[in-house]
Interface confidence: medium
């Protein structure tokens, strides 16, 4: 999946995850992902997105919440919650990649 086009210059985002090389990153958009694996506490990661924009369409479930935004450091103060409203198979963008 190519980088999302027509967004103009890259955006700077807060980066807080094991994959971060520093406190910020640059990408086509910013992300906050809250994931709860079975038997573990939810883990929240902040970073940059370049691929699979369709994931941004997914609404919260009891296991994952994937939020995207497009402005400078827009993911810095976003605090996500998990909401048991959909099963994972109902998330958008899963028919083809």
């Amino acid at each position: 999946d190519p980088v999302k086009p027509s967004r103009g210059p890259l955006v700077t985002c807060t980066c807080e995850s094991p994959h971060c090389r520093g406190p910020t990153c640059q990408g086509a958009w910013c992300t906050v992902v809250l994931v709860r694996e079975e038997g573990r506490h939810p883990q929240e990661h902040r970073g940059c997105g370049n691929l699979h924009r369709e994931l941004c369409r997914g609404r919260p479930t009891e296991f994952v919440n994937h939020y995207c935004c497009d402005s400078h450091l827009c993911n810095r103060n976003v605090s996500l919650v998990l909401e048991a409203t959909q099963t994972p198979s109902e998330q958008p963008g899963t028919d083809s990649q």
């Epitope: 999946d1 027509s6 967004r7 609404r59």
Partner: antibody, heavy 120, light 113 residues
Framework: QVQLQESGPGLVKPSQTLSLTCTVS??????????WSWIRQHPGKGLEWIGY???????YYNPSLKSRVTISIDTSKNQFSLKLSSVTAADTAVYYC????????????WGQGTLVTVSS | DIVMTQSPDSLAVSLGERATINCKSS????????????LAWYQQKPGQPPKLLIY???TRESGVPDRFSGSGSGTDFTLTISSLQAEDVAVYYC?????????FGQGTKVEIK
């Protein structure tokens, strides 16, 4: 001004495949800012969303139609298409193509719609 | 699927009077993390495609007259036409874009009394 225009046969025989194309003008279908949908409206009835496609080719289909639906995109022609297989009289409807903003916000541009009748 | 139920199915209102259309979703369409309601309203006149009026439950689309307003909470929503005009005669639909598949209400027909 963005415009969408549906085209395709107005009459399809039962068990055959309905094929429609939506041509987008006044804007690029390759923009990552939008998703492109097909929606239908049975005569005198409400609206039923069929599915969407993103510029990358990723799709999502209404589960009620998923086994019969294919949506594809041709960015070089600024078009996206709908194929609905094994049609019956129940598929007789006005078919609309529409544009949806990336972050949601509803369908802001629609085609005029094309009536497809399924009959032998 | 989220079921959208509108009421009434039709209503007749005198010119210049207020028209109120209700829409109820079978589950919440509020994305609480970002406090946004994933609900839109459309107007459809005979022989025309639907026209977007309101999105995010209460934001008017550009060019839509300010006599149209939307309000509501997680599951109960209202479209209000503050002073009905002759050109407002149409069918109005609510639409949720929170959970796929996107779904619409059955429509409310607004006529002049």
């Amino acid at each position: 001004q963005v415009q969408l225009q549906e085209s395709g046969p107005g009459l399809v025989k039962p068990s055959q495949t309905l094929s429609l194309t939506c041509t987008v003008s006044g804007g690029s279908i390759s923009s990552g800012d939008y998703y492109w949908s097909w929606i239908r409206q049975h005569p005198g009835k409400g609206l039923e969303w069929i599915g969407y496609i993103y510029y990358s080719g990723s799709t999502y289909y209404n589960p009620s139609l998923k086994s019969r639906v294919t949506i594809s995109i041709d960015t070089s022609k600024n078009q996206f298409s709908l194929k609905l297989s094994s049609v019956t009289a129940a598929d007789t409807a006005v078919y609309y193509c529409a544009r949806e903003r990336d972050y949601g916000g509803g369908f802001d541009y629609w085609g005029q719609g094309t009536l497809v009748t399924v009959s032998s | 699927d989220i079921v959208m139920t509108q009421s009434p199915d039709s209503l007749a209102v005198s010119l210049g009077e207020r028209a109120t259309i209700n829409c109820k979703s079978s589950q919440s369409v509020l994305y609480s993390s970002i406090n946004k309601i994933y609900l839109a309203w459309y107007q459809q006149k005979p022989g025309q495609p639907p026209k977007l009026l309101i999105y995010w439950a209460s934001t008017r689309e550009s060019g839509v007259p300010d006599r149209f307003s939307g309000s509501g909470s997680g599951t109960d929503f209202t479209l209000t036409i503050s002073s009905l005009q002759a050109e407002d005669v149409a069918v109005y639909y609510c639409h949720q874009y929170y959970s796929t598949p996107w779904t619409f209400g059955q429509g409310t027909k607004v006529e002049i009394k």
